[in-house]
């Protein structure tokens, strides 16, 4: 039941994401730590290290009101699940530093990625004999 | 804003395979899971299956057997291919874009494809 | 598979009406439900995912809510260009099933 909440919270996350792609040229173009093909059971520890980066509103036009409420719901904490516990006490998970660094729109579709690869798995895990590959 | 186009033969004879492709506009295919679905004459929708961008695919068990879903990612497109058809398979045809792995943001306006001979 | 039963079939109302489609599972499907607007010939549209959360630039009048088995579309004010088919669409587990439609159309 957390769990469910927890991925239910990640396909709105993917909404706001989205979202942000539309204004990354009003974003502070500094590179950010982006995991990419995460190593199973560390996905929590990657989504941590996403949420802490520090993307940043360039202050410019009308919609820096948006971006950063944008953001502000992007950091907001999940509710605590035994997994996501287990995962942030591996000692094996790469540090949010050892990640390469991107520039925001690279960074926010690593983001997407992580989230959907989280979202497939749980849709994977309740279904049996329809993946294929 | 993403596009989507579906294209492909109107008719196709019993026995044989359909073959459609779906071209993707205004964004990138390089991310996203990709889908066919389709609505036979007077009926409801049918998930037919999807491919993420990586190539990983899921398809509906009714149809697996028969299915093959591909993607194209340097033409930006993805295609379905439905062999041994029958007129159990006359349907409008819609690929569609899944950024939230299980619903369906984006949609083709869909292809009529008849199976007769 | 899971099944989805939409009610009623098809429903009359005017321009300014409260319209609501209801939306079963067979089984619980926790708030993965999405709701769509398909008219004739056009692409189908994207409303409501996760039960409740409105998609990007979809008018506020749509509104969904339930969790488990039983769930919503409510339009709060009906306007000239709501009218068109709904369908609900489960989002739990895959096969994915889609309800068999609610026509929506002028009294």
């Known amino acids: 039941q957390g769990q469910d909440r927890h991925m239910i919270r990640m396909r709105q996350l993917i909404d706001i994401v989205d979202q942000l792609k539309n204004y990354v040229n009003d974003l502070v173009p500094e590179f950010l730590p982006a995991p990419e093909d995460v190593e199973t059971n560390c996905e929590w520890s990657a989504f941590s290290c996403f949420q802490k980066a520090q993307l940043k509103s360039a202050n410019t036009g009308n919609n820096e009101r948006i971006i950063n409420v944008s953001i502000k719901k992007l950091k907001r904490k999940p509710p605590s699940t035994n997994a996501g516990r287990r995962q942030k006490h591996r000692l094996t998970c790469p540090s949010c530093d050892s990640y390469e660094k991107k520039p925001p729109k690279e960074f926010l579709e690593r983001f997407k990625s992580l989230l959907q690869k989280m979202i497939h798995q749980h849709l994977s895990s309740r279904t049996h004999g329809s993946e294929d590959s | 804003q993403v596009q989507l186009q579906e294209s492909g033969p109107g008719l196709v004879k019993p026995s044989e395979t359909l073959s459609l492709t779906c071209t993707v506009s205004?964004?990138?295919?390089?991310?996203?899971?990709w889908g066919w679905i389709r609505q036979p004459p007077g009926k409801g929708l049918e998930w037919i299956g999807y491919?993420?961008?990586?190539?990983?695919?899921n398809y509906n068990p009714s149809l697996k057997r028969r299915v093959t879903i591909s993607v194209d990612t340097s033409r930006n497109q993805f295609s379905l291919k439905l062999s041994s058809v029958t007129a159990a398979d006359t349907a409008v045809y819609y690929c569609?874009?899944?950024?939230?792995?299980?619903?369906?943001?984006?949609w083709g306006q869909g292809t009529l494809v008849t199976v007769s001979s | 598979d899971i099944q989805m039963t939409q009610s009623p079939s098809s429903v009359s109302a005017s321009v300014g009406d409260r319209v609501t489609i209801t939306c079963r599972a067979s089984q619980g499907i926790s708030s993965w439900l999405a709701w769509y607007q398909h008219k004739p010939g056009k692409a189908p549209k994207l409303l409501i995912y996760?039960?409740?959360s409105l998609q990007s630039g979809v008018p506020s009048r749509f509104s969904g809510s339930g969790s488990g088995t039983d769930f919503t579309l409510t339009i709060s004010s009906l306007q000239p260009e709501d009218f068109a088919t709904y369908y609900c669409?489960?989002?739990?587990?895959?096969?994915?099933?889609f309800g068999g439609g609610t026509k929506v159309e002028i009294k």
């Open positions: 205004g964004g990138s295919i390089s991310s996203d899971f």
């Open positions: 569609a874009r899944s950024a939230g792995v299980a619903d369906f943001d984006f």
């Open positions: 669409q489960q989002a739990n587990s895959f096969p994915l099933t």
């Open positions: 491919i993420s961008s990586r190539g990983s695919t």
């Open positions: 996760v039960a409740s």
